[in-house]
């Protein structure tokens, strides 16, 4: 599998992974004990036909062209978890692996 | 996990799974021996903020609001394989499980 990586200086218009640091402190999310910030990344860009299509299904839907199908969009195709320490609703401290918090790759689906 | 199911008579504007039968014969894709057609489904509809968001990451990116982030789009969040019989490039008949051919659920990511 393959995905493009870009940064804020890139001129790439196609679907690409961009760096993004999420800052829980800046959001005022005080129930998150740690990390206070982490590298989350995000996906942005255009999905020309066939470019970075994750699934054969995407191509088949384009071919069948049903009513209301908007064409593929740039979205995470591989994600990974991070470990977090946080308060749950009962004010207990929880340490756990939270899935799908980091975008590792972007593609068109 | 939860996703909406719609059909061609639905008035739902939000992200939804719609039925779609892919017909390889109609495409002229005769290198696919079987199946000749299968129920693939597809995703279509609007992604209002927080509706059917698959990942906490989606919410975080919205919150951080980086340059060029287009907001979530309606995309497959659960897919399943089908068994296929087909000719490869060397004209050998291959029988195999092809991943991500059927959309089981749609969501916003």
């Amino acid at each position: 599998d393959f995905g493009l990586d870009c940064d804020e200086h890139s001129t790439e218009s196609r679907c690409c992974r961009y760096p993004l640091t999420v800052d829980f402190e800046a959001f005022g999310w005080d129930w998150i004990i740690a990390p206070k910030r982490y590298k989350a990344n995000y996906c942005s860009g255009e999905c020309e036909f066939v470019f970075l299509q994750k699934y054969p299904h995407t191509h088949l839907v384009h071919q069948a062209n049903p009513r209301g199908s908007a064409g593929p969009c740039c979205t995470p195709t591989k994600m990974s978890p991070i470990n977090m320490l946080y308060f749950n609703g009962k004010e207990q401290i929880i340490y756990g692996k939270i899935p799908a918090m980091v975008v590792d790759r972007c593609g068109c689906s | 996990d939860f996703g909406l199911d719609c059909d061609e008579h639905s008035t739902e504007s939000r992200c939804c799974r719609y039925p779609l039968t892919v017909d390889f014969e109609a495409f002229g894709w005769d290198w696919i021996i079987a199946p000749k057609r299968y129920k693939a489904n597809y995703c279509s509809g609007e992604c209002e903020f927080v509706f059917l968001q698959k990942y906490p990451h989606t919410h975080l990116v919205h919150q951080a609001n980086p340059r060029g982030s287009a907001g979530p789009c309606c995309t497959p969040t659960k897919m399943s394989p089908i068994n296929m019989l087909y000719f490869n490039g060397k004209e050998q008949i291959i029988y195999g499980k092809i991943p991500a051919m059927v959309v089981d659920r749609c969501g916003c990511s």
């Epitope: - | 014969e25 290198w31 021996i33 000749k36 004209e91």
Partner: antibody, heavy 124, light 107 residues
Framework: QVQLVQSGAEVKKPGASVKVSCKAS????????MHWVRQAPGQGLEWMGN????????NYNQRFKARVTMTVDKSTSTAYMELRSLRSDDTAVYYC?????????????????WGQGTLVTVSS | DIQMTQSPSSLSASVGDRVTITCKAS??????LSWFQQKPGKAPKSLIY???RLVDGVPSKFSGSGSGQDYTLTISSLQPEDFATYYC?????????FGQGTKLEIK
């Protein structure tokens, strides 16, 4: 509806060749295997081979391999079976049959449509 | 090649009878067995595939069973139109091979 129409009866001399045709209609000809089966008078059925019209990939019974050629003409949706160096024991009715895939496994097939058969008589 | 031995080679029965035809393969054929009916001067007609599945449009009086090397075709209540020759076919391996046939005659 799906139909296979075969060419008419032939009388051939030993050592000659015969080419039997099978014209398909009512379906996408290129996407289904065509098989050839023969039956000598008063005898059982014998599988000769198959061909996939899309790419002409074929598979022959070793018993006939040196003498048989299966071909297709996609423009007319017609399959052909040529048998060379005919002998008297090649006298038989030759059938074409479409092989239909019904299942989920690599050998999930059955014959759903047959041609009417072509009698080939080999006699000096 | 896989040998298919069909028995009996001929069988006399009366209308209303229940009859069974067997087919034995020279090795395990993984239930890739079909049954055909053939009437004089006609092409064979598929009845059963994958050992026990009925082809669309075939009456339920026909049934198939078996696994491994041994398979049977049963006709539950014979009607005049059922008197014909029946063949089995293995499709587990190339070349496909047929049984020698069972001729079902009116007693």
């Amino acid at each position: 509806q799906v139909q296979l129409v075969q060419s008419g009866a032939e009388v051939k001399k030993p050592g000659a060749s015969v080419k039997v045709s099978c014209k398909a209609s009512g379906y996408s000809f290129t996407g289904y295997f065509m098989h050839w089966v023969r039956q000598a008078p008063g005898q059982g059925l014998e599988w000769m081979g198959n061909i996939y019209p899309y790419n002409s990939v074929s598979n022959y019974n070793q018993r006939f391999k040196a003498r048989v050629t299966m071909t297709v003409d996609k423009s007319t949706s017609t399959a052909y079976m040529e048998l060379r160096s005919l002998r008297s024991d090649d006298t038989a009715v030759y059938y074409c049959a479409r092989r239909y895939y019904y299942g989920t496994g690599p050998a999930d097939w059955y014959y759903d449509v047959w041609g009417q058969g072509t009698l080939v008589t080999v006699s000096s | 090649d896989i040998q298919m031995t069909q028995s009996p080679s001929s069988l006399s029965a009366s209308v209303g009878d229940r009859v069974t035809i067997t087919c034995k393969a020279s090795q395990d054929i993984n239930s890739y067995l079909s049954w055909f009916q053939q009437k004089p001067g006609k092409a064979p007609k598929s009845l059963i595939y994958r050992a026990n599945r009925l082809v669309d449009g075939v009456p339920s009086k026909f049934s198939g069973s078996g696994s491994g090397q041994d398979y049977t075709l049963t006709i539950s209540s014979l009607q005049p139109e059922d008197f014909a020759t029946y063949y089995c076919l293995q499709s587990d391996e190339f070349p496909l091979t047929f049984g020698q046939g069972t001729k079902l005659e009116i007693k």
